[in-house]
């Protein structure tokens, strides 16, 4: 008996071939001997089966002695043995219909779990193997689970169902709802305008929800809410914003915040949360602000940074085109009695400059100039 695997919702074509390469009378029946369809004269005729409105044949093939049974919009319960009667012969085809669905929505928040459930006909014992977009393989029986979804899990999951040495492939598009970056650091000199961007790693037609940016300044004992906003069909509207600092927010995606001035008291870490409509849980992105200030007070040239810096970052003070006078893995460096000239304060990571501030030191009889 020939075995054919089908996918729920798809169309399957069961073949039946006569030895004579011409149109002759044929009938398709199910295992209960109920007629599904056949031909009478040149007409396609249908029987009283449940498939009536979903069964068809391909008349253009009858001339060649081929009498297919086409079943559209397959259901699991269409799994059965189908019998083609032609030329006093009976051809049997066993159809097994499988369905593979994601537990809930196919749009899941980062960190959530994905469960794929296999619908299969009674008496079948299929095995399932799924391959994620990042090439991770998972195997299982009726259910497959992946916990802690990551951004790289977004995309097409390819699942193969094996039964009777035959296989059928399902493709499920999964969208992991997350920000493009889990964390970002902005390095700014004191007084500069700060731009925070929170690009999403997915696109959906309608995006609705609400969000908030909580900020923990390095100098502050507790965090505070800097801004709250609503998102409606990708349009951003500010609900509430603090007076200090007075953040500005872009009206369109990606989410964009502007801090008019980088000041030491703002240096610190923020957490932007976005709660999406009809989703449990929130999207998070951490943002860090590092602020640099270079000053000269009497005979002391000082460079300081505020905010979350890693211990391996190097802070240096050097006269332009000269070797660094001072270089330390600390958040403040200084030079006593600095020579006149253009001094550079550099924050670097393995030789790569992250932040630079220049200060001009004048001969001792004048006052310093900060460009």
């Amino acid at each position: 008996k020939k075995v054919v695997l089908g996918k729920k919702g798809d169309t399957v074509e069961l073949t039946c071939t006569a030895s004579q390469k011409k149109s002759i009378q044929f009938h398709w029946k199910n295992s209960n001997q109920i007629k599904i369809l056949g031909n009478q004269g040149s007409f396609l005729t249908k029987g009283p089966s449940k498939l009536n409105d979903r069964a068809d044949s391909r008349r253009s093939l009858w001339d060649q002695g081929n009498f297919p049974l086409i079943i559209k919009n397959l259901k699991i319960e269409d799994s059965d043995t189908y019998i083609c009667e032609v030329e006093d012969q009976k051809e049997e085809v066993q159809l097994l219909v499988f369905g593979l669905t994601a537990n809930s929505d196919t749009h899941l928040l980062q960190g959530q779990s994905l469960t794929l459930t296999l619908e299969s006909p009674p008496g079948s014992s299929p095995s399932v193997q799924c391959r994620s977009p990042r090439g991770k393989n998972i195997q299982g029986g009726k259910t497959l689970s992946v916990s802690q979804l990551e951004l790289q899990d977004s995309g097409t999951w390819t699942c193969t169902v094996l039964q009777n040495q035959k296989k059928v492939e399902f493709k499920i598009d999964i969208v992991v709802l997350a920000f493009q970056k889990a964390s970002s650091i902005v390095y700014k000199k004191e007084g500069e305008q700060v731009e925070f961007s929170f690009p999403l790693a997915f696109t959906v037609e309608k995006l609705t929800g609400s969000g908030e940016l909580w900020w923990q300044a390095e100098r502050a004992s507790s965090s505070k809410s800097w801004i709250t906003f609503d998102l409606k069909n990708k349009e951003v509207s500010v609900k509430r914003v603090t007076q200090d600092p007075k953040l500005q927010m872009g009206k369109k995606l990606p989410l964009h915040l502007t801090l008019p001035q980088a000041l030491p008291q703002y240096a610190g870490s923020g957490n932007l949360t976005l709660a999406l409509e009809a989703k449990t849980g929130k999207l998070h992105q951490e943002v860090n602000l590092v602020v640099m200030r270079a000053t000269q007070l009497q005979k002391n040239l000082t460079c300081e940074v505020w905010g979350p810096t890693s211990p391996k970052l190097m802070l240096s003070l050097k006269l332009e085109n000269k070797e660094a006078k001072v270089s330390k893995r600390e958040k403040a460096v200084w030079v006593l009695n600095p020579e006149a000239g253009m001094w550079q304060c550099l924050l670097s990571d393995s030789g790569q400059v992250l932040l630079e501030s220049n200060i001009k030191v004048l001969p001792t009889w004048s006052t310093p100039v900060q460009p």
Epitope: Q40, G41, S42, F43
Partner: antibody, heavy 120, light 107 residues
């Protein structure tokens, strides 16, 4: 002898109804699909309707769809054509025909025809 | 709908003549074609089915050929009882459609 005999024709006013019958004999009626074909005076042949052997599948010409109904009673070896909302252009000789059981069709047995005249 | 065009619409011939009637379909119908003969006041009679298959009891002087869109009915030697109107009919698609007919008259 294989035979088909139509009856029920006659004169009817536009908008009226008529039911044609076709009595089959000499063959296993319940094993064959059947059709109705008509011929207007001095004109060619026009296929009207088809019914499968079990009466489940029916096809109609666009010109009669929604007005004519083909049916059969296999226990009485009889084919019917219920004609409603008749129009002048339905005036014709109506033939019942047996569909050849070969896979290519063709109507291999025909009745002698019954005349339907639609006129006021 | 598939249109069936027959030619000629009428012809005059003598007993013993070879007569050819053609039928053209507006689209390919493979071999889904039948030919009928109809005499005045009588029901049509099936002559050929599947373009070239002779119906049981029909004299062998009748033959059919063709496939796709062009078909031919040939009467190899016309007999007195063959004077009638001939129709082609496609059964590839519903609605079934007939050609306009070819009337074969005595010359």
């Amino acid at each position: 002898e294989v035979q088909l005999l139509e009856s029920g024709g006659g004169l009817v006013q536009p908008g009226g109804s008529l039911r044609l019958s076709c009595a089959a004999s000499g063959f296993t009626f319940s094993s064959y699909a059947m059709s109705w074909v008509r011929q207007a005076p001095g004109k060619g042949l026009e296929w009207v309707a088809f019914i499968s052997d079990d009466g489940i599948t029916k096809y109609y010409a666009d010109s009669v769809k929604g007005r004519f109904t083909i049916s059969r009673d296999n226990s009485k070896n009889t084919l019917y054509l219920q004609m409603n909302s008749l129009r002048a252009e339905d005036t014709a000789v109506y033939y019942c025909a047996r569909d050849d059981s070969s896979g290519y069709g063709g109507m291999d047995v025909w009745g002698q025809g019954t005349t339907v005249t639609v006129s006021s | 709908d598939i249109q069936m065009t027959q030619s000629p619409s009428s012809l005059s011939a003598s007993v013993g003549d070879r007569v050819t009637i053609t039928c053209r379909a507006s689209q390919s119908i493979n071999r889904w074609l039948a030919w009928y003969q109809q005499k005045p006041g009588k029901a049509p009679k099936l002559l050929i089915y599947s373009a070239s298959n002779l119906q049981s009891g029909v004299p062998s002087r009748f033959s059919g050929s063709g496939s796709g869109t062009d078909f031919t009915l040939t009467i190899s030697s016309l007999q007195p009882e063959d004077f009638a109107t001939y129709y082609c009919q496609q059964s590839y698609n519903t609605p079934l459609t007939f050609g306009g007919g070819t009337k074969v008259e005595i010359k």
